[in-house]
């Protein structure tokens, strides 16, 4: 990886072994601010694999509140409206971090997880294997 | 929002005032483990409006890298593998949590930002403006 | 270890109740997976009774299960429940939970069941 | 409901045999079907999915065709470990929310 110079003015860190404690500022800088209003948030019903956005609660998680996206269909659009299920909607999945309560409860103490979540669907052609 | 009851064994909290800063646990607990493999990686070329993932570094921040989708096409593929203009190939986004090392170089000290990436493609229907 | 335990089975009197349990463990059902409730009778085969996205809590059922058999899921405890009511002889079989195999956000548990509890017993019987 | 026809109900071979089990569905359920196996007092073991698509760990012995409504099981070369009884399954829902989840009767496979 690459290494970096260490800043003189950061904190003393207490504990150099892992598992890595750190001190973590959770005043959320938004880098979206300036982001483009046109990315449309009808593309969930527009899409030919339209999907559904459900609210994922946990109050021991940061965020608490995630959107997950499930596919209506098995199949995808065609032009005349109808599903075609030759075709395959499927979700689009991204790991990302998230911040767990640890020990339960505790409203300063976090630990880093990983979790899937499903962001949107895609149309997809399936994938046939052929029996020699 | 949801009254999580105080855990009395958390670590004590320095700074009770906003900016809030908090203490987390680097060692990333992976709940993914062990969902299936079949959520496809091939999706990106399989999909009606494929894409091509773009690795964004940047050492300052956790994760340093991070895969960004970037859509093939303006429109989206057909039946016959050409590429039809009258539906639009469109990046589905997301908000995602990362930390920033602030001061900048520190190894123990961020703070959480917020930054929309690009996880993959959708076809939609195009939004026709009719001129009265 | 990734496992589902099925609890509760036993031996039930015609027209009764009985609720089973599906513990799940080493995965978390934050997120969308189908748990399903499979069934087979004595030296009979397998038949469907049912699933439940633990995302949105939408339910499917054979149709012969609508009214009499109900299925729940707890995310916070990681279990999923089938409740059984006026329970007849015909009833009477080794009740399966099943994980379907493709996580996140599909429409319907398309892709089979890849992962399978133990069994638990019912006997239906005066 | 859909029904699922699964043929033969059983089926006598011997180690090495190229085995051929048959499923057809009432109506069209695309390529949304999969095949199980199940031994003896055992839960049943997913082989393969949406029709054609061999699950992680299962050999290649065991491979699926079909789409529609006519689907096959085929063990290239039987091995002792194969005796058992074998199920297709529907796995298909439409865009009504109507969801049809059917097991085949079952073919079992003996020596």
């Known amino acids: 990886g690459i290494t970096i110079p260490r800043n003189p003015g950061c904190p003393n860190s207490e504990d150099k072994n892992f598992p890595r404690t750190v001190m973590v500022n959770l005043n959320i800088h938004n880098r979206n601010t300036n982001t483009n209003p046109k990315r449309s948030s009808d593309y969930y019903n527009r899409s030919t694999s339209p999907w559904n956005l459900h609210r994922n609660e946990d109050p021991e998680r940061y965020p608490s509140v995630i959107w997950e996206a499930k596919c209506r269909h098995l199949g995808c659009i065609n032009a005349d409206g109808n599903v075609d299920y030759h075709m395959n909607s499927v979700p689009i999945q991204q790991e990302i971090l998230v911040l767990r309560r640890e020990p339960p409860h505790c409203p300063n103490s976090f630990r880093l997880e990983k979790i899937l979540v499903s962001v949107g669907c895609t149309c997809v052609t399936p994938i046939v294997h052929h029996v020699a | 929002g949801i009254t999580i009851p105080r855990n009395p064994g958390c670590p004590n909290s320095e700074d009770k005032n906003f900016p809030r800063t908090v203490m987390v646990n680097l060692n990333i607990h992976n709940r993914n483990t062990n969902t299936n493999p079949k959520r496809s990686s091939d999706y990106y070329n399989r999909s009606t409006s494929p894409w091509n993932l773009h690795r964004n570094e940047d050492p300052e921040r956790y994760p340093s890298v991070i895969w960004e989708a970037k859509c093939r096409h303006l429109g989206c593929i057909n039946a016959d593998g050409n590429v039809d203009y009258h539906m639009n190939s469109v990046p589905i986004q997301q908000e995602i949590l990362v930390l920033r090392r602030e001061p900048p170089h520190c190894p123990n000290s961020f703070r959480l930002e917020k930054i929309l990436v690009s996880v993959g493609c959708t076809c939609v229907t195009p939004i026709v403006h009719h001129v009265a | 270890e990734v496992q589902l335990v099925e609890s509760g089975g036993g031996l039930v009197q015609p027209g009764g109740s009985l609720r089973l349990s599906c513990a799940a463990s080493?995965?978390?059902?934050?997120?969308?997976?189908?748990m399903c409730w499979v069934r087979q009778a004595p030296g009979k085969g397998l038949e469907w009774i049912g699933c439940i996205d633990t995302g949105d809590g939408t339910t499917y059922y054979a149709s012969w299960a609508k009214g009499r058999f109900t299925i729940s899921r707890d995310n916070s405890k990681n279990t999923v429940y089938l409740q059984m009511n006026s329970l007849r002889a015909e009833d009477t079989a080794v009740y399966y939970c099943?994980?379907?195999?493709?996580?996140?956000?599909?429409?319907?548990?398309?892709?089979?069941?890849?992962?399978w509890g133990q069994g638990t017993l019912v006997t239906v019987s005066s | 409901d859909i029904q699922m026809t699964q043929s033969p109900s059983s089926l006598s071979a011997s180690v090495g045999d190229r085995v051929t089990i048959t499923c057809q569905a009432s109506?069209?359920?695309?390529?949304?079907l999969s095949w199980y196996q199940q031994k003896p007092g055992k839960a049943p073991k997913l082989l393969i999915y949406?029709?054609?698509t061999l699950t992680s760990g299962v050999p290649s012995r065991f491979s699926g065709s079909g789409s529609g409504t006519d689907f096959t099981l085929t063990i290239s070369s039987l091995q002792p470990e194969d005796f058992a009884t074998y199920y297709c399954q529907s796995n298909f829902g439409t865009a009504s929310t109507t969801y049809y989840n059917t097991f085949g009767g079952g073919t079992k496979l003996t020596v």
């Open positions: 109506e069209s359920i695309y390529r949304y």
């Open positions: 080493g995965f978390s059902f934050s997120g969308f997976y189908y």
């Open positions: 949406l029709a054609s």
């Open positions: 099943a994980r379907d195999a493709a996580y996140g956000g599909y429409a319907y548990p398309a892709h089979g069941m890849d992962l």
